[in-house]
């Protein structure tokens, strides 16, 4: 998941040096830009969120608002502020003429202006069927811990509170942010109006058909009747769900989102702040049969964004439409006729479709974690919904062909034991944004602020690219790889890992000139090799070389083709052990893969040798695979035969730090 | 504190209609309805109804449908049961309880029905 | 008659277990987490022990404890008390009401 990504309109307008009368102007060469939702009917042109600079204060905010009013009057126009932003993002919400637009981008602090849009409930549809007395036997599932030391926050329509599912187990708050419901002839029935936030209470924490039966709820009301809402209300309500923290600190707090509008820099912009602020967001992917990195706040990658699947492990198919996909997506939950409260009446049952509802059965999980480990970050959290989930039961081909490879295989479960899961060490692929094809294009994946970057690799369709390399930026390690000469385009695919007290760092190793190839090693007491890269400059690396084969007693080297430089990813960290294991085969195989026993945790995928027939290698769960071109356009044997390496690692610090909590 | 108070004991005749109050504080009202108990000389409970303090939805039990009228007055955080017909096995003390869950109780209103 | 059944009484000596049982069908018992258990004491209102299933509320002694397998659920008081002698009603959801047991004097012998 990237900030930067989405098939997003972004207009940058230059400032212009006949402001008349700005007693501040911005700082030299800095252009505030314009951004507005890539989706026209979702548009809400005429209000505005001005968001100004990080460290901008309150009363800077206000000024600046009523600078623009002031400024705004002048020219004769009418502006109104509807909001001041602080606590989470310093900006307003301004409503006014687009008009205004090259005036405000020119104000003192601004860092961005984003026109509002539209955000939309993700369950289709409202009411399939009336379900009463719920389909299975209450005895079925009975979890160990209901989740009940953790506040979850619901932004949606307004509920029926007292629905017997959920009465006594849900606050409604005096938050109310939503737009007017389209039509003159609309009738606001009241039943209707409660529907999809009374069934995701349920499904969150109902007594008889929730996941998290002992989680207690807030809900802000974001959602019209019709399930329509905004981006701007949507960050009041975040903002409103901070203050609270704030005000009174209480314990874990999960906030379900189980909306999806258009991508918006915004609205990801204050999940990142709130998720950095210690909160766990969980988001619908979205119900378009679309890349999740197209809507928000599913592109936000600091969110636990779900997809749906059915009873069957598929993805869900809604009408003509069905659950979104790709690599902003972190797993799949049951999103197909799920039953729970209806606002119909205080005793209903209905079921409901949607990947609101896979969100919802995420966010119960988190809460039965949460409460179970109430020192859990969202890192930690994010690593164990994906280390419990089922692996590989989704039906792949029901993904566009390019987006298979992106899309987790992951269905959530629920840990078979809430507790002693601390030894393991966890770790998680993480796809970066599609590079592009031009000559000199990189893609960057990174890991979450506190997990480690352990390797990275390289992934393009067309064979065309010039490897990868780890390197720092912004005081943390990123994973970047490079782009061919003709080539569609690469990926960048980090290995993300929780490894607490670890000292990781790079060695690299130009090219060599010798015919051995090139190679590097973990030469530091202590440390270990967790991942190998090798990135090249030349067009097309010795596609009839002959392959580099790692000597054999040498686990703590990378080796790599003579005209590569070639990085080795180093790790030091308490009880740290690794080994390599390779998986070659002489003749020519679309894919090699190789796994990790049960027990070691995949921490580096990478391919021998590193040819141009290769199209890269990345990881999947704990097996390393690599993939080559189709073999009916590989020459010889010889330049056919490929090697998966996979380097394993396990933290028996971790291992016997669980043993003494026991 | 949690509380629900109802009003003082009645004594009807058959046929007649009684209606009972009760008033709940201490809470967010609109997180739970009230429930209607009743319990006859002697005898176990018997579940009436329940109505939401939210949107004024009733759910009445088919003993009672038809002769009784649950109603909430959101502006004195009131709840009335009314019951009609009147019939001498009517004889009970009626409790209000909140919720479905009913987890809190008023003190009781004994209604008499005797000719 | 009630919905749920239960024994018409049932007694113990201080300090001594007792359980209740509480026996419905599939459609209220077996199939709601909802049963809950009330003590009554004479000319008062019912008190809430135990809430669905298991669950105690606050200021509700460790002594009460309650679970459920199947149709039936069960209420146990250990440790048995002098105050402990009332009368004790089970309910449970059904899909569209609420049943109660038809109480269970317990006598503290």
């Known amino acids: 998941q990237e900030d930067e990504d989405g098939d997003y309109e972004e207009l940058v307008l230059a400032l212009r040096s006949e402001e008349d009368g700005l007693a501040e102007a911005p700082e030299h060469g800095t252009t505030a830009t314009f951004h507005r939702c890539a989706k026209d009917p979702w548009r809400l042109p005429g209000t505005y969120v001005v968001v100004l600079k990080e460290e901008t204060h309150l009363s800077q905010s206000e000024r600046t608002a009523r600078r623009l009013q002031a400024q705004a009057a002048r020219r004769g126009y009418l502006t109104k502020i509807l909001h001041v932003f602080h606590g989470l993002l310093p900006g307003f919400l301004v409503k006014m003429s687009g008009d205004l637009l090259e005036l405000a981008l020119k104000l003192p602090h601004v860092d961005y202006i984003e026109e509002d849009s539209s955000v939309f409930a993700q369950s289709i549809p409202w009411n399939l069927e009336r379900i009463t007395p719920p389909r299975y036997r209450a005895d079925e599932y009975q979890p160990p811990d209901g989740g009940s030391l953790v506040e979850v926050y619901l932004l949606d329509t307004s509920i029926q509170s007292d629905h017997r599912e959920i009465e006594g187990r849900v606050m409604v708050t005096d938050f109310e942010n939503v737009p007017e419901e389209d039509g003159t002839r609309f009738h606001r029935q009241a039943s209707k109006c409660d529907s999809h936030g009374t069934h995701l209470a349920g499904v969150v924490s109902g007594r008889d058909a929730g996941v998290a039966k002992g989680a207690s709820m807030r809900s802000l009301r974001v959602l019209n009747c019709q399930g329509k809402g905004t981006v701007s209300g949507t960050l009041i309500g975040l903002e409103f769900i901070r203050k609270s923290q704030l005000v009174q600190p209480v314990g874990p707090l999960v906030v379900l989102l189980p909306l999806a509008g258009g991508y918006s820099r915004v609205l990801n912009a204050a999940c990142q702040r709130l998720a950095r602020a210690g909160v766990v967001l969980v988001t619908a992917a979205g119900n378009f049969r679309d890349d999740a990195c197209l809507y928000s706040p599913a592109s936000a990658p600091e969110v636990i964004t779900v997809g749906a699947t059915n009873a069957q492990d598929q993805p869900v198919t809604l009408g003509t439409l069905g659950t979104n996909f790709g690599r902003c997506v972190d797993l799949f939950a049951p999103g197909e006729d799920i039953i729970g409260a209806s606002s119909d009446c205080s005793t209903c049952f209905v079921s409901q479709s949607g990947t609101s509802q896979a969100a919802a059965h995420v966010a119960g999980i988190a809460a039965m974690m949460l409460s179970a480990e109430p020192e859990l970050t969202l890192a930690e959290l994010r690593q164990r919904l994906i280390h419990f989930s089922a692996k590989d039961v989704i039906n792949e081909a029901w993904f566009p062909e390019d987006q298979r490879v992106l899309t987790p295989n992951l269905v959530a479960a629920l840990p078979p034991s809430t507790h002693g899961a601390g030894w393991q060490l966890f770790c998680r692929t993480v796809w970066s944004a599609h590079s592009g094809p031009t000559r000199m294009a990189t893609a960057v994946a990174r890991c979450a602020p506190d997990e480690e970057l352990l390797s990275c690799s390289s992934f393009s369709r067309s064979g065309k690219r010039r490897g990868e390399r780890m390197e720092a930026q912004g005081g943390k390690l990123v994973c970047r790889a490079h782009n061919a000469f003709g080539g569609e385009g690469v990926y960048a695919i980090a290995r993300c890992c929780l490894l607490p007290q670890a000292n990781c760092s790079v060695h690299t190793a130009p090219p060599a000139e010798a015919s051995m190839g090139t190679r590097v090693h973990c030469h530091q007491q202590g440390h270990v090799l967790t991942g190998c890269s090798s990135h090249w400059e030349v067009e097309d690396l010795g596609t009839h070389k002959p392959p580099v084969l790692r000597p054999r007693g040498q686990p703590n080297q990378c080796v790599g083709h003579r005209e590569a430089s070639i990085h080795a990813s180093c790790c030091h960290a308490p009880g740290l052990e690794c080994k390599v294991k390779e998986h070659g085969i002489p003749a020519p195989q679309e894919q090699v893969t190789v796994a990790c026993e049960e027990g070691w945790t995949l921490t580096g995928c990478s391919a021998l040798p590193g040819t141009s027939h290769v199209l890269g290698a990345y990881a999947v769960d704990n097996t390393c695979v690599v993939r080559s071109r189709d073999v009916s356009t590989t020459g010889s044997t010889s330049e056919g035969a490929v090697t998966a390496v996979a380097i394993c690692c396990r933290s028996r610090h971790l291992a016997q730090a669980s043993q003494e909590l026991q | 504190q949690i509380q629900l108070v109802q009003s003082g004991a009645e004594v009807k005749k058959p046929g007649a209609s009684v209606k009972v109050s009760c008033k709940a504080s201490g809470y967010t009202l609109t997180s739970y309805g009230i429930s209607w108990v009743r319990q006859a000389p002697g005898q176990g409970l018997e579940w009436m109804g329940w109505?939401?303090?939210?949107?004024?939805?009733?759910n009445y039990a088919q003993k009672v449908q038809g002769r009784v009228t649950m109603t909430t007055d959101t502006s004195t955080s009131t709840v009335y049961m009314e019951l009609r017909s009147l019939r001498s096995d009517d004889t009970a003390v009626y409790f209000c309880?909140?919720?479905?869950?009913?987890?809190?109780w008023g003190q009781g209103t004994t209604v008499t029905v005797s000719s | 008659q009630s919905a749920l059944t239960q024994p018409a009484s049932v007694s113990g000596s201080p300090g001594q277990s007792i359980t209740i049982s509480c026996t419905g069908t599939s459609s209220d018992v077996g199939g709601y987490n909802s049963v809950s258990w009330y003590q009554q004491h004479p000319g008062k209102p019912p008190k809430l022990m135990i809430y669905e299933v298991s669950n105690r509320p606050s200021g509700i002694s460790n002594r009460f404890s309650g679970s459920k397998s199947g149709n039936t659920a069960s209420l146990t008081i250990s440790g048995l008390q002098a105050e402990d002698e009332a009368d004790y009603f089970c309910s449970s959801y059904t899909s569209t009401s609420m049943v109660f047991g038809g109480g269970t004097k317990l006598a503290v012998l």
């Open positions: 309880a909140r919720g479905y869950g009913m987890d809190v």
């Open positions: 109505i939401s303090f939210y949107n004024g939805n009733t």
